[in-house]
């Protein structure tokens, strides 16, 4: 689940079994010149950044929930 910082794909691997309880925010990065794939980077309650699998149904659910809560705030 390491997150790199250079101008390339930031997610070297993704975490399995992520739970929404400790996710403070989610950043969805669309494919671009720096990286050919969609990347989902979550910031956890303790400040740690973790890469999530954008194809995972639970991750899709988490992103949807986060976007909906952003809209209602």
């Amino acid at each position: 689940a390491s997150v790199a910082t250079e101008l390339r794909c930031q997610c070297l691997q993704t975490l399995q079994g992520i739970h929404p309880k400790n996710i403070q925010s989610v950043n969805v990065k669309s494919p671009g010149p720096h990286c050919a794939q969609t990347e989902v980077i979550a910031t956890l309650k303790n400040g740690r950044k973790a890469c999530l699998n954008p194809a995972s149904p639970i991750v899709k659910k988490i992103i949807e929930k986060m976007l909906n809560s952003d809209k209602s705030n």
Epitope: A1, L15, Q16, G17, I18, H19, K21, N22, A42, L44, K45, N46, G47, R48, A50, I58, K61
Partner: antibody, heavy 119, light 107 residues
């Protein structure tokens, strides 16, 4: 390596209070939720509640609200649970357990503290 | 609160054999189930989380499957050190709730 060291066994009187401790080492104590779990003799496990030492945030099982109070001391990396107005129903082994940050699985547990309520 | 119904409450099996324990949740728990091994005088040990992910250091003889409300946990090639009580735990919704436990004995 991660370790959770709990305080020793307690023999207490009905109606009194007890405070048990769980000293954490081997990780950033402030950054992980600490859970507390009860096991009565010959019975299963019951989740009491949890505390996030970083900001003092707590979640309680409604069944234990008012019975147990969770606190944490960041300077000593120690979590505490105070049990009030003790009755024989509170005689049990109490465990602390760290909750992993990303998937909330309880991955490390203390050895348990036995509390016996008896007159 | 979500209820977790675990069965059987006890079982006896032969060394080298296979056992399966089931847990049924009172509602969909989105695969957020963990399985613990508990031996007397010790703290419980996390074996599997998120339905099927094995904890580091746990032998591949242990496995878990399930979705929705129905989940199961299996141990194959039973060894003497597997004697323990096993619990499921749902952590989809607070309060976290455990199943009643399954005491495993060797014949």
């Amino acid at each position: 390596q991660v370790q959770l060291q709990q305080s020793g066994a307690e023999l207490v009187r009905p109606g009194s209070s007890v405070k048990i401790s769980c000293k954490a080492s081997g990780y950033a104590f402030s950054d992980y939720w600490m859970n507390w779990v009860k096991q009565r003799p010959g019975q299963g496990l019951e989740w009491i509640g949890q505390i996030y030492p970083g900001d003092g945030d707590t979640n309680y099982n409604a069944k234990f609200k008012g019975k147990g109070t969770l606190t944490a001391d960041k300077s000593s990396s120690t979590a505490y649970m105070q049990l009030n107005s003790l009755t024989s129903e509170d005689s049990a082994v109490y465990f602390c357990a760290r909750e992993r940050d990303y998937d909330v699985a309880m991955d490390y547990w203390g050895q348990g503290t036995s509390v016996t309520v008896s007159s | 609160d979500i209820q977790m119904t675990q069965s059987p409450s006890s079982l006896s099996a032969s060394l080298g054999g296979k056992v399966t324990i089931t847990c049924k949740a009172s509602q969909d728990i989105n695969k957020y189930i963990a399985w613990f091994q508990h031996k007397p005088g010790k703290g419980p040990r996390l074996v599997i989380h998120y339905t099927s992910i094995l904890q580091p250091g746990i032998p591949s003889r242990f496995s878990g499957v399930g979705s929705g409300r129905d989940y199961s946990f299996s141990i194959r090639n039973l060894e003497p050190e597997d004697i323990a009580t096993y619990y499921c735990l749902q952590y989809d919704n607070l309060p976290w709730t455990f199943g009643g436990g399954t005491k495993l004995e060797i014949k």
